[in-house]
Interface confidence: low
């Protein structure tokens, strides 16, 4: 049959070469004489060469040792051909099959391997794992399954046996007990990994076993009784810096410090804080001590490591005793911020409150007043009493310095202390409103057509509150009623102003009285821009121009006409009518009302 | 590694105590430190105390007097226990691993958190 | 205790560029044994818990994409985000572990403009 069994060839052979390994042979060969090729990599193309065929016996033939390392099995196919080139059989698979020799060592990932484990730790703790590798087959052969051992253990102590190694997964771990950081912190195991499971060829490498501290050392005070003076009243002043030794390894979990207040500390007016570098207790007042309430704290400090103890160990206590120092306090205003109602406008020389400080210190000690800040300038206080009094006119609507009708006033107290000190405390004067002001009308100036005219609205404000303000009444004065009306709205906080009756273009003064709820009246004048216009207006347009904008000598002549008329009216309306002299504009007004009347008769 | 706030009600009244539990899997309460954290709305992170290893425990000093932190190894569960809630104590408290027990794991930092239980203190 | 200062308190940026945010400490966080500097950041996304993305004031957490770069010692800390993606809007706390209590800054809020 045309067919080949996969053939075996150890790597590394010695030759000689070529080296016939079967020979491949077709039944069709009796008809005819056949030839015979193989082609794939090894043989036509890379690695090239390295098989070959006699073309007429069809010996197989290997040109050059193998290497399973590089190429662990190859595949060609053999052809068969008759004389004139024809195929007599199909391409045959040919598997050719690099068998493995023990020809490498092992070889460890790293020359050097760092692990570490707790001292004290019980036998068959693991410490770390190691690896070797090795390119030789380790599937069908031995030769590159990897036994680990361990040589040598340097130190020797406490004897030469406290590590041991799995054979196969290279993990180290702990056989023997007695692991002492302080007597060993590092051990040097010098590993080896050997292939043919153990029999083979041997590579070596070095496992550092670094003996982690275990917290088999308690911290202990030294001293372990401290005494301390504190000034009352600091916070955060370091009252005492309480010392410990630690045998365990310094700046580790099991050296570090960490300081509990046992006791003493009832007001948990104490803290205790560890220095991160020298492992100091830092003890601190959280809050401030009061001589006259207890001069002296009696306080009783534990000291244990961050990392818990891995034994039982005793607990190391130290005893603070803290005498706490007098120190002159400064009074105290009661409350801290006062707040009294006084109505605005009060008569100079009337009592507004008495605000007075206690001094906490037991001694009694005379306290003085003074004002130290009046934006105002509207008080006075008794430097004995605490009296204040009023010695301008409050005014609840300076806006300068009165905010939300409250004027804010800073005193002062001190005691004849040595060095003495000072307390303030804070005035809060609630002003009360009375009906001080009047309302008014905004806007002042207002511009409107003589023709179809727009009525304005006039909103009116009052700086006092309520009640003293709206609703308004409005009124007008001076005769301004003549010409205008004002209404005042139902909500009764803005006024209408209207023109009643025809005004020649500019300026009128209109007297507006407007009175608030509680009666009080404030007089404004009106400065009203009348203009030659029809419905709304902003500013006054051009000269007025009457009819239909018609020029030349005969409009010239009407308008000297009218304006001899209007001087000759003028004239009786002065003679016959007596007004007020403030009433002229009016007068005009009334005059140019007799000028329309002629104009439109022209028109 | 997952940890799991569990609380009582999450309205607490003024002056009333608050008690959370955390239970922790994927990993051992004598391996790690657990620490609890709170937020207040719209706040930042407030640091409140440490569980360590071996059962000691570190507290913010400020809250020291009115809190607790204890654990059950055996049942992966770290308590929290606070007295004396005022309305500044709202909050959503969490609890969060420490990376390590030791000082070279970066022990004060904090790898896994839970997912936090929100705590109102109100009348 | 420690005061951790964080700032800006907010800043946007559009996706792509590259930010940075500062966190001071009241007192250095470097010790000087094992020349470490004990500091760590968080990312807190809305309505999440926070998640660590570096300690030792440089080291980043496993899993933490590289574009996050903690840097600086002793007082001055930096976390800078090489190229931002819209899901880094958060808010970053610095947080020092030198002392006790630990405290955290009070956070740096990164909007996507």
């Known amino acids: 049959d045309w067919v080949v069994a996969p053939i075996s060839v150890p790597e590394n052979g010695k030759g000689p070469f070529p080296q016939r390994l079967n020979q491949l042979k077709s039944n069709k060969d009796r008809d005819t004489k056949i030839f015979y090729s193989i082609t794939g990599p090894g043989a036509d193309s890379p690695p090239e060469g390295v098989f070959a065929v006699e073309k007429e016996t069809g010996w197989l033939l290997l040109n050059k040792p193998l290497d399973r390392e590089e190429i662990a099995k190859y595949e060609l196919f053999g052809h068969a051909v008759s004389e004139n080139g024809a195929s007599v059989e199909d391409p045959m698979n040919i598997s050719i099959i690099v068998t493995d020799q023990n020809d490498h060592k092992p070889k460890f990932t790293q020359d050097t391997f760092r692990g570490s484990v707790l001292e004290g730790v019980l036998p068959g703790t693991s410490v770390m794992q190691v690896t070797a590798t090795d390119e030789d087959d380790a599937i069908y052969t031995y030769n590159g399954v990897v036994a680990y051992s361990i040589h040598s253990q340097e130190p020797k102590e406490p004897h030469d046996l406290m590590f041991t190694i799995h054979k196969s997964t290279g993990t180290i771990s702990v056989i023997s007990s007695g692991l002492d950081r302080e007597k060993v912190p590092e051990y040097t195991l010098t590993i080896q990994a050997t292939d043919m499971d153990g029999d083979g060829s041997t590579t070596t490498a070095v496992a550092v076993v670094e003996i982690l501290d275990a917290n088999d050392n308690a911290p202990m005070f030294d001293p372990q009784k401290y005494e301390a003076h504190v000034p009352e009243n600091a916070v955060g002043h370091e009252v005492q810096r309480l010392t410990v030794t630690d045998l365990d390894a310094p700046n580790s979990p099991a050296w570090r410090a960490t300081y509990l207040i046992m006791g003493g500390d009832d007001g948990d007016h104490f803290t205790i804080t560890t220095h991160p570098e020298s492992n100091q207790g830092i003890l601190t007042t959280r809050k401030g001590l009061d001589f006259e309430a207890k001069n002296q704290h009696t306080l009783y400090v534990e000291v244990t490591n961050e990392a818990p103890f891995v034994l039982k160990l005793p607990t190391s206590t130290a005893t603070i005793v803290v005498h706490v120092e007098d120190v002159n306090e400064a009074p105290v205003f009661v409350p801290p911020s006062k707040v009294v109602e006084v109505q605005e406008g009060i008569p100079t020389g009337e009592p507004v409150c008495v605000y007075t400080a206690e001094d906490p210190d037991k001694e009694n000690q005379k306290i003085s007043y003074r004002i130290l800040r009046d934006p105002a300038g509207w008080l006075a206080m008794d430097p004995d009493s605490g009296q204040v009094t009023a010695v301008g006119t409050l005014d609840r609507e300076d806006e300068q310095f009165v905010r939300n009708n409250i004027y804010e006033v800073m005193v002062l107290a001190m005691d004849n202390g040595s060095p003495p000190t000072t307390g303030t405390g804070t005035l809060l004067l609630t002003l009360i409103d009375v009906n001080d002001h009047g309302p008014v009308p905004e806007p002042r100036q207002i511009t409107i057509c003589n023709q179809s005219p727009v009525r304005q609205v006039l909103n009116i404000t009052d700086k006092d509150l309520s009640p003293h303000t709206s609703p308004f009444q409005a009124q007008l004065t001076d005769d301004s009623d003549i010409y205008w009306t004002a209404e005042v709205n139902e909500e009764g906080d803005t006024v209408v102003l209207s023109l009643k009756k025809f005004l020649k273009q500019d300026t009128y003064d209109v007297h507006l009285s407007l009175s608030d709820h509680g009666n009080k009246e404030q007089l404004t004048v009106i400065r009203a821009t009348v203009c030659d216009c029809h419905g709304h207006v902003e500013t006054c347009p051009g000269p007025w121009k009457g009819g239909s904008g018609g020029g030349g000598s005969g409009a010239g002549v009407i308008a000297v006409i009218v304006v001899v008329v209007i001087a000759i009216v003028a004239g009786i309306v002065v003679l016959v009518i007596s007004r007020k002299k403030r009433m002229a504009k009016y007068e005009k007004a009334e005059i140019k009302e007799m000028g329309e009347m002629h104009r439109e008769l022209n028109a | 590694v997952q940890l799991v706030e569990e609380s009582g009600p999450g309205l607490v009244a003024p002056s009333q105590s608050l008690s959370i539990t955390c239970t922790v899997s994927?990993?051992?309460?004598?391996?790690?430190?657990i620490n609890w954290v709170r937020q207040p709305p719209g706040k930042g992170l407030e640091w409140l105390g440490v569980?360590?290893?071996?059962?000691?425990?570190n507290y913010d000093s400020a809250l020291k007097s009115r809190l607790t932190i204890s654990k059950d190894n055996s049942k992966s569960q770290v308590f929290l226990k606070m007295n004396s809630l005022q309305t500044d104590d709202t909050a959503r408290y969490y609890c969060?691993?420490?990376?390590?027990?030791?000082?070279?794991?970066?022990?004060?930092?904090?790898?896994?958190w839970g997912q936090g239980t929100t705590v109102t203190v109100s009348s | 205790e420690l005061v951790m200062t964080q700032s800006p308190s907010s800043l946007a940026v559009s996706v792509g560029e590259k930010v940075t945010m500062s966190c001071k400490s009241s007192?250095?966080?470097?010790?000087?044994?094992?020349?470490?500097?004990?500091l760590a950041w968080y990312q807190q996304k809305p309505g999440q818990s926070p998640k660590l993305l570096i300690y030792w004031a440089s080291t980043r957490e496993s899993g933490v994409p590289d574009r996050f770069t903690g840097s600086g010692s002793g007082t001055d800390f930096t976390l800078t985000i090489s190229s931002v993606k819209a899901e880094d809007l958060a808010v970053y706390y610095c947080?020092?572990?030198?002392?006790?209590?630990?405290?955290f800054g009070g956070g740096t809020k990164l909007e996507i403009k």
């Open positions: 569980i360590w290893t071996g059962g000691g425990t």
């Open positions: 994927g990993f051992s309460l004598t391996s790690y430190p």
């Open positions: 969060a691993r420490s990376r390590g027990a030791y000082d070279f794991d970066g022990r004060g930092a904090m790898d896994y």
């Open positions: 947080q020092q572990y030198y002392s006790y209590p630990y405290t």
């Open positions: 007192q250095s966080l470097l010790y000087s044994s094992n020349q470490k500097n004990y």
